[in-house]
């Protein structure tokens, strides 16, 4: 697991404890909360990051209209159960034995139930729509420059392959970034769009997960792009199952 050898830290995850106790005295880093060894050459899974966070001290409109199955993470933080690979377990429960099913990004996709609730499989989130509003600028950003800069950001900072950034829409002051990655497209070693979206969300909130790296300094042709609101929609390969009561 690649970690910075000189001072034994994890460049891609500051919510880790690192020590030179790996093979041959190599630096090895474990996620806070779970103690799972993480690969510091890539992004840490959102499940392990959430667990670590819980353990830490506390005209022609071009914009996409999310469909009726789009999920928004309204439940906020919780202490998740992760599998040995760091993925969310399909069923999550709290200390009071209230359980619910989640998708691959850990967002609830069913009504809450009790311990008898069954979640047969972890349903993949294959389409993520990141909806941003930027702070005032002297003028609108050039769409193609904005598109190129955001694609570069996801490629270089989050190591997400460009083929998974499906589109960048812009209608001042709203920017939408569409990430698409279905099960068959994601190869071994590919960063998951859910993890990339979570790192991006934390970056724009000024809560970077990267070790020792400065905050996100997004610029389009030299002009700063400062995000003041973020809303993320998650679309699953199988639509969520909520009762009609929730939908009204």
């Amino acid at each position: 697991h690649t970690a910075a050898q000189d001072n034994c830290t994890c460049p891609t995850n500051k919510m880790t404890v690192c020590s030179p106790d790996g093979p041959g005295g190599r630096c090895q880093c474990r996620a806070l909360g779970s103690g799972v060894a993480v690969d510091c050459s890539t992004l840490t899974s959102k499940c392990l990051l959430l667990k670590a966070r819980m353990s830490a001290p506390k005209n022609a409109r071009t914009l996409v209209r999310p469909n009726e199955h789009a999920l928004v993470d309204n439940d906020g933080l919780y202490d998740p159960d992760c599998d040995p690979e760091g993925r969310f377990k399909a069923r999550q429960c709290n200390q009071t034995s209230v359980c619910w099913c989640v998708n691959s990004v850990g967002v609830r996709r069913t009504d809450k139930g009790d311990l008898s609730l069954r979640c047969d499989e972890l349903v993949r989130t294959h389409h993520i729509l990141i909806d941003l509003r930027h702070r005032p600028t002297a003028g609108a950003f050039n769409h193609s420059d904005l598109d190129a800069e955001l694609r570069r950001l996801f490629r270089e900072r989050y190591r997400l392959h460009p083929k998974f950034v499906a589109a960048v829409h812009y209608e001042q002051p709203t920017i939408q970034i569409e990430l698409r990655q279905n099960t068959s497209q994601k190869a071994a070693g590919d960063v998951d769009i859910g993890d990339a979206a979570y790192y991006f969300e934390r970056d724009v909130k000024g809560e970077s997960l990267f070790q020792g790296r400065g905050g996100l300094d997004l610029r389009v042709r030299g002009e700063p792009l400062q995000v003041e609101r973020t809303l993320i929609y998650y679309l699953d390969e199988i639509p969520p199952k909520f009762s009609m009561k929730r939908l009204t």
Partner: antibody, heavy 123, light 109 residues
Framework: AVTLDESGGGLQTPGGALSLVCKGS????????MGWVRQAPGKGLEYVAA???????GYGAAVKGRATISKDTGQSTVRLQLNNLRAEDTATYYC?????????????????WGHGTEVIVSS | ALALTQPSSVSANPGETVEITCSGG????????YGWYQQKAPGSAPVTVI????KRPSNIPSRFSGSTSGSTNTLTITGVQADDEAVYYC?????????FGAGTTLTVL
């Protein structure tokens, strides 16, 4: 601590030119918009000019066409050049720092001020 | 050109709560942005008490707060002190230029 030090004020002649310099310290100069605000004797605050971290500029109506704002990131300085001086340019000129890098025109974002430099335009 | 509207003067006894309103700023796609600047004497440097509607610089006491409702921003001083006596200017923007209100004189009785 953030400090902004202005220089270049003093007695100026009508029709002449003025160059004010503000040196910033205690913050990452390149990351923030900077600007100039002035106050004529007995009057309120007036936006003069500003420059964003990406070097886009904005000017107040009273100085548009006569003023040029520029910056030297390496020296952490912002400069205001004001030509064709008039008696109504007499004021205390304050250097101001934005809390953001973005558009220079949003005085709502000013989070720090210099002590000011007095300019008197008189023959 | 837009003009910011704020009261010319307000007064309060020590310990009371004071509210100063500012309206007329430019609309940026449904959002309005304001800042508040305290000047204790003419020619003395202004001090930012609130910027970007609600943000308070670290050196400003917590009794100063800002809030926005629609196109109006309100500076609230909770438990006003004698030292708060000053002129308070609000600032916003009008398309490509910054604008300031005429100032509100706060007198602490």
């Amino acid at each position: 601590a953030v400090t902004l030090d202005e220089s270049g004020g003093g007695l100026q002649t009508p029709g002449g030119a003025l160059s004010l310099v503000c040196k910033g310290s205690g913050f990452t100069f390149s990351s923030y918009a900077m600007g100039w605000v002035r106050q004529a004797p007995g009057k309120g605050l007036e936006y003069v000019a500003a420059i964003s971290s990406g070097s886009s500029t904005g000017y107040g109506a009273a100085v548009k066409g006569r003023a040029t704002i520029s910056k030297d990131t390496g020296q952490s300085t912002v400069r205001l050049q004001l030509n064709n001086l008039r008696a109504e340019d007499t004021a205390t000129y304050y250097c101001a720092k934005s809390g953001y890098g973005g558009s220079a025109s949003y005085v709502s974002d000013i989070d720090a001020w210099g002590h000011g430099t007095e300019v008197i335009v008189s023959s | 050109a837009l003009a910011l509207t704020q009261p010319s003067s307000v007064s309060a006894n020590p310990g009371e709560t004071v509210e100063i309103t500012c309206s007329g700023g430019g609309d940026y796609y449904g959002t309005y942005y304001y800042g508040w600047y305290q000047q204790k004497a003419p020619g003395s440097a202004p001090v930012t008490v609130i910027y970007d509607n609600t943000k308070r610089p670290s050196n400003i006491p917590s009794r100063f707060s800002g809030s926005t409702s629609g196109s109006t921003n309100t500076l609230t001083i909770t438990g006003v002190q004698a030292d708060d006596e000053a002129v308070y200017y609000c600032g916003s923007y009008d398309s490509s230029a910054g604008i300031f209100g005429a100032g509100t004189t706060l007198t602490v009785l």
